[in-house]
């Protein structure tokens, strides 16, 4: 059978080979399509409700005024010329519809490096057969399930027209230190060959690089945190991040009721100041970060200062913030 591809809604003419060019003609068309059960016979005399779908023209050709999805199938003509020679024509008709240009909806303007992000949803409406959607990064195809790329697809069929709507949601995990303005696009590839792909307008989200969280350093003077009664201890919270975060202080796991400051001075140390101290840096972009804890202890004259003193009383004594 000869393969014929016809666009939905367009007319189609199928030639009946060997048919006399004008009546009287001995020919018959048989069709087996979505509109028929087994074979439907159409003759040149025809003329009837089937004319809305297919009718035999005076030259013996079969004319379909507006091809529909239900017209996919087999069309056969059997004709006899004036000399009694029989000729058969056999066609396999497939139909197609090109959708409108695909679009990317719900697109992200900003992506975060190192974590999965939804880039957007590509939508194609009105195709037949369904066809496929694919994503591109900087013009190169993106392969799902590779290098942090995942795609969620959905296909719906219109209950009346039978045409397809395709949706494809793209998730990516941009690499740190990669392209700060990647270009994403989506293309629709028709289900029938010989039809070029349709591509969306590109989108260019910014990639935001979160500053790597460097450790919050707590420096204590004197080193080791052991001090004679009445001495002074200085705790300094060092945070490399910019802009400078807010620094709060903790003692024995409880926040100290003090205004934010990167330096905590404990003058005239007494037993009530002994304990475990840490600082907490709060960044606007990624929450609080706590330093290691250090122990502050009192040593009597002549004692060796321990690196980690035991926890003492809970009194605050006198605190000074630089």
């Amino acid at each position: 059978a000869q393969n014929i591809t016809a666009r939905i809604g367009e007319p189609l003419v199928l030639k009946c080979k060997g048919a006399p060019k004008k009546p009287p003609q001995r020919l018959e068309w048989k069709l087996n399509t979505g509109r028929t059960e087994a074979w439907k016979v159409l003759s040149p005399q025809g003329g009837g409700p089937w004319d809305s779908v297919a009718r035999v023209l005076p030259n013996g050709s079969l004319f379909l005024p507006a091809v529909g999805i239900q017209d996919e199938g087999i069309f056969r003509c059997q004709a006899m010329n004036r000399n009694g020679k029989e000729t058969k024509s056999n066609y396999r008709v497939r139909v197609y519809q090109i959708p409108g240009k695909p679009e990317i909806v719900d697109s992200a303007s900003e992506l975060t490096a190192g974590v999965p992000n939804k880039v957007g949803t590509c939508v194609s409406e009105g195709s037949y057969p369904a066809g496929t959607l694919s994503w591109h990064l900087d013009g190169k195809p993106l392969v799902p399930n590779e290098k942090g790329v995942s795609v969620k697809e959905q296909t719906r069929r219109h209950p009346e027209t039978g045409l397809f709507t395709l949706q494809s949601e793209l998730m990516v995990t941009p690499a740190r230190g990669g392209d700060p303005r990647p270009t994403f696009s989506c293309s629709f590839s028709p289900g029938l060959p010989r039809h070029r792909a349709l591509r969306t307008a590109p989108i260019q989200p910014r990639v935001w690089e979160p500053v790597p969280l460097e450790e919050v350093q707590l420096v204590v003077e004197p080193e080791g945190g052991a001090v004679a009664p009445g001495g002074t201890v200085t705790l300094t919270c060092e945070v490399p991040a910019q802009p400078s975060p807010q620094i709060h202080w903790m003692k024995d796991g409880v926040p100290l009721p003090l205004p934010p400051s990167p330096v905590l001075i404990l003058p005239e140390i007494g037993p009530q100041d002994q304990g475990t101290y840490s600082c907490v840096a709060t960044h606007s972009s990624h929450g609080p970060q706590e330093s290691r804890a250090v122990s502050i202890s009192i040593i009597e004259p002549g004692e060796e200062g321990p690196t980690a003193g035991s926890v003492g009383g809970s009194g605050l004594g006198t605190l000074a913030l630089a």
């Epitope: 509109r35 089937w50 004319d51 809305s52």
Partner: antibody
Amino acid sequence: EVQLVESGGGLVQPGGSLRLSCAASGFTFNNYWMTWVRQAPGKGLEWVASIDNSGDNTYYPDSVKDRFTISRDNAKNSLYLQMNSLRAEDTAVYYCARGGDILDSLPYWGQGTLVTVSS
Amino acid sequence: DIQMTQSPSSLSASVGDRVTITCRASQDVGIYVNWFQQKPGKAPRRLIYRATNLADGVPSRFSGSRSGTDFTLTISSLQPEDFATYYCLEFDEHPLTFGGGTKVEIK
């Protein structure tokens, strides 16, 4: 909402003529075949004529062929039935209906107009 | 021309009854048969299209079936508003042919 409104019926003498009209609204008129169906008093339904959406092809049963002519004006969303050489047996309510083809056969009907052929 | 032989021509039934009306085509008409309901003084209303499909707005107690050239309209539980005349229509070929009608009356 699809609406079909017939007009032009009335009393006519045998051998006379009458022209029925059908005004269509609520759908894209030139996309559809149109049909006239009639019903004699106390009788069943009988197909009278059909026309394709372009108006190029018309179809009739033998009982009215050569006497009745179906036509349409797509610009005016109107369907017509020109009835000549009327006979007593043409007395009926005439309905205009959308469709009559394989794709869409008579889902919508007008309320009908009565044609009486009598001397 | 195709003949559509409809039976019975009339029937009496009660509310709640199951009612079956049949049309037999004189030759193969595929699935191209519709069923209509008509009440006195009103235009016909399409109930079933292409043998088995329920038209929009038609109650689900109506159904259509086909076996070869035999077409059946079934009302599963007759309601008071269903007392009317029912017609089948063949539209596979011209002339379009209606069945003779079945009048459903109250018993």
